[in-house]
């Protein structure tokens, strides 16, 4: 006996009460795969989530975080609190960069500059709590016989910079 | 650290009003949902309804006919009113926060025993 | 409205030994689900919250998986301290809904 489940498109289920008819899926579900016996109940987005996009009978609706916040987790199953560029998420709450790191994000943890020595070169602009160190040529490029058609900045280590 | 501490008439009489209040100590009251949920030995935990600090609710659908959750923001405290109570309303009630990352509940009151009997 | 069931009701396991507590949903939930621990005469703590995320200063030895409609608490050494009921908690959809709990003894 062939099943005739397997005919029902996305957006419908399989009613057997009725005789294996495809039964469009009732308000507030869906049903994103054809040959559904059942239709999942729609997500809602609240408390801490808002609606990205609105459930329709194909495909479940989909949640952000409200503002503040940010979104983490497989579909946004969570969300985390934004922190200011140059600071980092703490148990207790943002805490700025230490120094010496930098995050240039609204979220993740504060990374270290980068150390331009390891690749021969010297800092060409030092690193605050919000941007990394940008390097520059190595120290020997800079000698005098080097050839340079604009002199470079001069250049500081890190440890200088303001904070 | 945040804490809740509640408080409210323990023992009811058949069709009287329950009436709890939960008290909200440290932390950031206004930007936060604040949960009821109640907990019987034949039901388990059963989640009552919420409020935020504007006042919005989400109510159980099957409380929501005798149910009313008020907020007093100016006291950082939160209300629970449950009418015409029967035995089956018999339980611990808990007050407790929605945390900042997700719909779940990371700070919880002590527990009132509410006991409903003639 | 959404139906979480915890079976077995009580779990038996020796101190050292890992302790496996399936939680089912009636239908699929992404990963909006949390776990509670309840001991004797206290509040449910939250333990785990987006199926698998530890909240603060819950030990290591607490784990989560799964996603959609079956989930799993792991507690991977189990110490005396870990005797209590455990729920699961869905998030997906309003009414928020509590699995029925599993308890966990000394064998």
């Known amino acids: 006996l062939q099943d005739l489940c397997s005919n029902c498109p996305a957006g419908t289920f399989c009613d057997n009460n009725r005789s294996q008819i495809c039964s469009p899926c009732p308000p507030n579900s869906f049903s994103s795969a054809g040959g559904q016996r059942t239709c999942d109940i729609c997500r809602q987005c609240k408390g801490v989530f808002k609606t990205r996009k609105e459930c329709s009978s194909t495909s479940n609706a989909e949640c952000d975080c409200i503002s503040g916040y940010h979104c983490l987790g497989a579909e946004c199953s969570m969300c985390e609190q934004d922190c200011k560029q140059g600071q980092e998420l703490t148990k207790k709450g943002c805490k700025d960069c230490c120094f010496g790191t930098f995050n240039d994000q609204k979220r993740g943890i504060c990374r270290p500059w980068t150390n331009c020595s390891l690749d021969g070169k010297s800092v060409l602009v030092n690193g605050t709590k919000e941007r990394d160190v940008v390097c520059g040529p190595s120290p020997a490029d800079l000698s005098p016989g080097a050839s340079s058609a604009t002199p470079p900045a001069p250049a500081r280590e890190p440890g200088h910079s303001p904070q | 650290q945040v804490q809740l501490q509640q408080w409210g008439a323990g023992l009811l009489k058949p069709s009287e009003t329950l009436s709890l209040t939960c008290g909200v100590y440290?932390?950031?009251?206004?930007?936060?949902?604040w949960s009821w949920i109640r907990q019987s030995p034949g039901k388990g935990l059963e989640w009552i309804g919420e409020?935020?600090?504007?006042?919005?609710?989400e109510y159980n659908p099957s409380l929501k006919s005798r149910l009313t959750i008020s907020i007093d923001t100016s006291k950082n405290q939160f209300s629970l009113k449950l009418t015409s109570v029967t035995a089956a309303d018999t339980a611990v009630y808990y007050c407790?926060?929605?945390?900042?990352?997700?719909?779940?509940?990371?700070?919880w009151g002590q527990g009132v025993l509410v006991t409903v009997s003639s | 409205k959404i139906v979480m069931t915890q079976s077995p009701a009580t779990l038996s396991v020796s101190p050292g030994e890992r302790a496996t507590l399936p939680c089912r949903v009636s239908?699929?939930?992404?990963?909006?689900l949390a776990w509670y621990q309840q001991k004797p005469g206290q509040a449910p703590r939250l333990l785990i919250y987006?199926?698998?995320t530890r909240a603060t200063g819950v030990p290591a030895r607490f784990s989560g998986s799964g996603s959609g409609s079956e989930f799993t608490l792991t507690i991977s050494s189990l110490q005396s301290e870990d005797l209590a009921l455990y729920y699961c908690?869905?998030?997906?959809?309003?009414?928020?809904?509590f699995g029925g709990g599993t308890k966990v003894e000394i064998k």
């Open positions: 407790a926060r929605m945390g900042y990352h997700s719909p779940s509940f990371d700070f």
């Open positions: 409020i935020n600090h504007s006042g919005n609710t």
């Open positions: 239908q699929g939930i992404g990963s909006n």
């Open positions: 440290g932390g950031s009251f206004s930007t936060n949902y």
């Open positions: 987006g199926a698998s």
């Open positions: 908690q869905q998030y997906n959809n309003w009414p928020l809904t």
